[in-house]
């Protein structure tokens, strides 16, 4: 039977001779050279050689356990003379014994990690891992221990796990953002003589909102013309915040000051500046300077940092309103004046007033816009704004005169303003009433006395306050011996009545009847109108059948025969 146990061979042999492995030996071997030993299998004849007489095995090359830890070979012992095996072929193992010839190697040459600034001590950052190719089952060749070579006192590493943690309180990104940490992994449990490897860990502190916004100055001053429309930007202010990104976002607001209602502040969404804008129309003459208290605050605040103080800051903004030369302002938006139509030329109707609203209070001169008074009926005193007539008026021609008055700054003619002036012409009884139409009527030859042959109506261009009251009568020269009578109906109408029974058209074909119409106003106005009455032949119903042709061409005028 074979006489051997497992063979062990130390790796990485560096001697000058072949490395002795062990001896194959059969108890049939009497030492007389009659047996021959043969080796086959992993590396036989190349890595491993055997002395066929003695059975001694040697390794011809330096072996690396990490490359191949076990070799499986087969042994034979045969009788040289007969060539027959004296032992059955048997498998045996050469196990390569580990030495500490491999240093730990990290899974990454460079690690990148982040951790929030101001983290508590012991906050996990990243875990690094190193592996050692040596035999973990034998000795400490592969027992890795981690340590920090660079990066203290900021970070620490757990020796067994490779977990990197923060080691210093209140690490501030605004102070230092980047850290390069060097970690060593050493085998042999970290003991002397152990092999080591290193890796670099680049650690970036990420931002947290641990800084409030701060105005670089306590007071800002801007100017804006009083003419700036609402929405106009008038200046920019900027609070700085040492944080970044969302933590550096700033909201601006006006918290106090007389300009609270007059101005607004918005945040420029890109530059994070505060833009002061006009909210309402300004007036230099009312207020020349405004003071605002503007606050800058972080919209997103981390409660754990509130102990550092409020996450806001305020500054005073002084806004100077600049005077803009404004046109004169009339005391009214429109003027309504009245004047009697019988007013003499140069009669004063009333006056307008305009003032320069500017602090300078420049004097103004007045004028009438002649496009609105082409006939030059009115004029104005350029100095005091008195309006007076320059022509006679007639209410019956034009009741309202709509003119425009201009006020112009004497020192700056470009600055002018206009106001409408509505002048009402008041009625005076200067028109006599007259017939509403031309009256030409007829009377039947067989008419009876007191028969109504025509109703008269009158009109008057005047417009008396209490309404028209007309009276009608026959003209004095026709009143006596007239063939007709006038009956005043007291309702601004009158009737013509026959005064006798029967008329003869052959005797008198046409009567001209003069009628006096008077009004009831002061001074009384009257006129005389003529009514033409033709005598006609009529049927028994009183319908006209024929009249004298002369009547159609008879001149109008007074007829003594009426």
């Amino acid at each position: 039977s074979w006489m051997w146990n497992q063979f062990f061979l130390l790796e990485e042999y560096t001697g000058s001779d072949y490395q002795y492995v062990g001896k194959l030996h059969s108890d049939q071997d009497r030492g007389d050279g009659s047996l021959k030993y043969i080796l086959s299998g992993d590396g036989a004849g190349d890595l491993f050689i055997i002395n066929e007489n003695t059975g001694d095995i040697q390794a011809t090359k330096r072996l690396d356990r990490e490359e191949k830890p076990v070799y499986i070979l087969r042994a034979q012992a045969i009788n040289r003379r007969t060539g027959r095996p004296v032992e059955p072929e048997s498998e045996f193992i050469i196990k390569i014994h580990d030495i500490n010839d491999n240093e730990p190697i990290f899974t990454k040459e460079v690690y990148t990690a982040t951790v929030p600034e101001m983290s508590d001590v012991g906050t996990f950052v990243v875990q690094v891992t190193a592996t050692d190719a040596d035999d973990p089952t034998y000795g400490n060749s592969a027992k890795v221990v981690y340590s920090i070579l660079q990066g203290q006192p900021y970070f620490s590493v757990e020796s067994e796990t490779g977990i990197i943690k923060t080691a210093l309180l209140n690490m501030d990104r605004e102070n230092r953002e980047q850290y390069q940490v060097v970690i060593q992994a050493k085998d042999m449990g970290g003991q002397m003589g152990g092999l080591s490897g290193t890796t670099t860990v680049n650690i970036t502190l990420t931002d947290v909102n641990d800084n409030p916004p701060r105005f670089p100055q306590s007071t800002y001053q801007f100017k804006t013309p009083e003419s700036s429309p609402p929405g106009t930007p008038i200046g920019r202010i900027k609070a700085s915040d040492a944080d970044v990104g969302e933590n550096a976002e700033i909201e601006y607001s006006i918290t106090d000051g007389e300009g609270l209602d007059m101005f607004d502040v918005i945040t420029d969404q890109e530059t994070q500046e505060g833009i002061i804008t006009v909210k309402k129309l300004l007036d230099f003459e009312k207020k020349k300077v405004y003071t605002l208290k503007v606050e800058a605050s972080n919209p997103y605040v981390e409660p754990r940092f509130l102990y550092l103080g409020p996450f806001k800051d305020s500054a005073t903004v002084r806004i100077v309103v600049e005077d803009v030369d404004e046109p004169p302002v009339f005391s009214k938006l429109a003027y309504i004046l009245q004047i009697r139509e019988d007013a003499q030329i140069n009669t004063t109707i009333g006056s307008v007033t305009a003032q320069d609203p500017d602090a300078a209070r420049n004097p103004v001169k007045y004028s009438v816009d002649r496009h609105t008074d082409m006939d030059r009926i009115f004029n104005i005193d350029s100095g005091n704004g008195s309006i007076f007539t320059s022509k006679l008026l007639d209410r019956e021609t034009l009741l309202w005169h709509n003119i425009t008055v201009i006020a112009t700054e004497i020192n700056n003619p470009k600055q002018s303003s206009r106001v409408p002036l509505y002048i009402k012409v008041l009625d005076v009884n200067d028109n006599a009433p007259e017939f509403a139409e031309f009256y030409e009527t007829f009377v039947c030859e067989k008419a009876k006395a007191d028969q109504l042959i025509q109703t008269l109506h009158a009109v008057d261009k005047d417009d008396p306050y209490s309404g028209h009251q007309f009276s009608f009568s026959l003209a004095p020269e026709a009143a006596s011996g007239s063939n007709f009578t006038i009956q005043d109906n007291k309702d601004n109408t009158a009737g013509i009545l026959t005064r006798k029974n029967g008329y003869n058209r052959h005797e008198m074909s046409t009567y001209l009847l003069p009628v006096v119409i008077s009004d009831n106003d002061y001074p009384v106005q009257s006129s005389t109108g003529t009514v033409t009455v033709r005598v006609c032949a009529c049927d028994h119903h009183g319908n006209m059948q024929s009249c004298h042709a002369e009547a159609l061409i008879h001149p109008t005028g007074l007829s003594t025969g009426a």
């Epitope: 929405g231 930007p233 918005i266 969404q269 890109e270 530059t271 994070q272 833009i275």
Partner: antibody, heavy 121, light 107 residues
């Protein structure tokens, strides 16, 4: 005077690409976020993309309908805005406007004349 | 995403009329973030009212804006012939969104 002039529009087949440019002048380009807005024929306005300023790392935002197909970019040294349009679809047919916000980067105050992109086979 | 709904979608009115267009947001927004635009056929949109209330440069005073939270309004006090156009509201929170538009036509 603020001026925005778009170019690069034209006829392209579905699946094709096109690059629009916008030349800006009359204002400080570097302080404004910039946008592309489009309008399909006879339809309403649709925002396409926005790019922020350098301070904000040139952050970009897109409408869902163009995400992963369109890329907005800017060249501050040339006062120029770009829109790279890939994998074009027929529904991308529209007039594309280059638009600058108002002061404070609110609203869309200044619009170019637009450039027509037609996607058709 | 914040949706904006304009009403009415279209509107017929006469010169001199007072017109109101409303814009309703699906969730509350700051008045700073709501704006109104006018667009005429074949033209680029024009900023009309910014930050809910403020008239853009050159915009006549007959235009006004109001509102807060989720409800905003554009008012034209006395329509002029040049006001017939399409009006859009828009909000600033990414993704920026527009209302569907209100077409104002001559009656």
């Amino acid at each position: 005077e603020v001026q925005l002039v778009e170019s690069g529009g034209g006829l392209v087949q579905p699946g094709g690409s096109l690059r629009l440019s916008c030349a800006a002048s009359g204002f400080t380009f570097t302080t404004y976020a910039m946008n592309w807005v489009r309008q399909a024929p006879g339809k309403g306005l649709e925002w396409v993309a926005r790019i922020r300023i350098k301070n904000n790392n040139y952050a970009t935002y897109y409408a869902d309908s163009v995400t992963d197909r369109f890329t907005i970019s800017r060249d501050d040294s040339k006062n120029s805005l770009y829109l790279q349009m890939n994998s074009l679809k027929t529904e991308d047919t529209a007039v594309y406007y280059c638009v600058r916000p108002d002061y404070g980067n609110y609203g869309l105050a200044y619009w170019g004349q637009g450039t027509l992109v037609t996607v058709s086979s | 995403d914040i949706q904006l709904t304009q009403s009415p979608s279209s509107l017929s009115a006469s010169v001199g009329d007072r017109v109101t267009i409303t814009c309703s947001a699906s969730s509350s927004i700051s008045s700073h973030y709501l704006h109104w635009y006018q667009q005429k056929p074949g033209k680029s949109p024009k900023l009309l009212i910014y930050r809910s209330f403020y008239l853009a440069s050159g915009v006549p005073s007959r235009f006004s804006g109001s509102g807060s939270g989720t409800d905003f309004t554009l008012t034209i006090s006395s329509l002029q012939p040049e006001d017939f156009a399409t009006y859009y509201c828009q909000q600033d929170i990414v993704p920026l969104t527009f209302g569907q538009g209100t077409k104002l036509e001559i009656k």
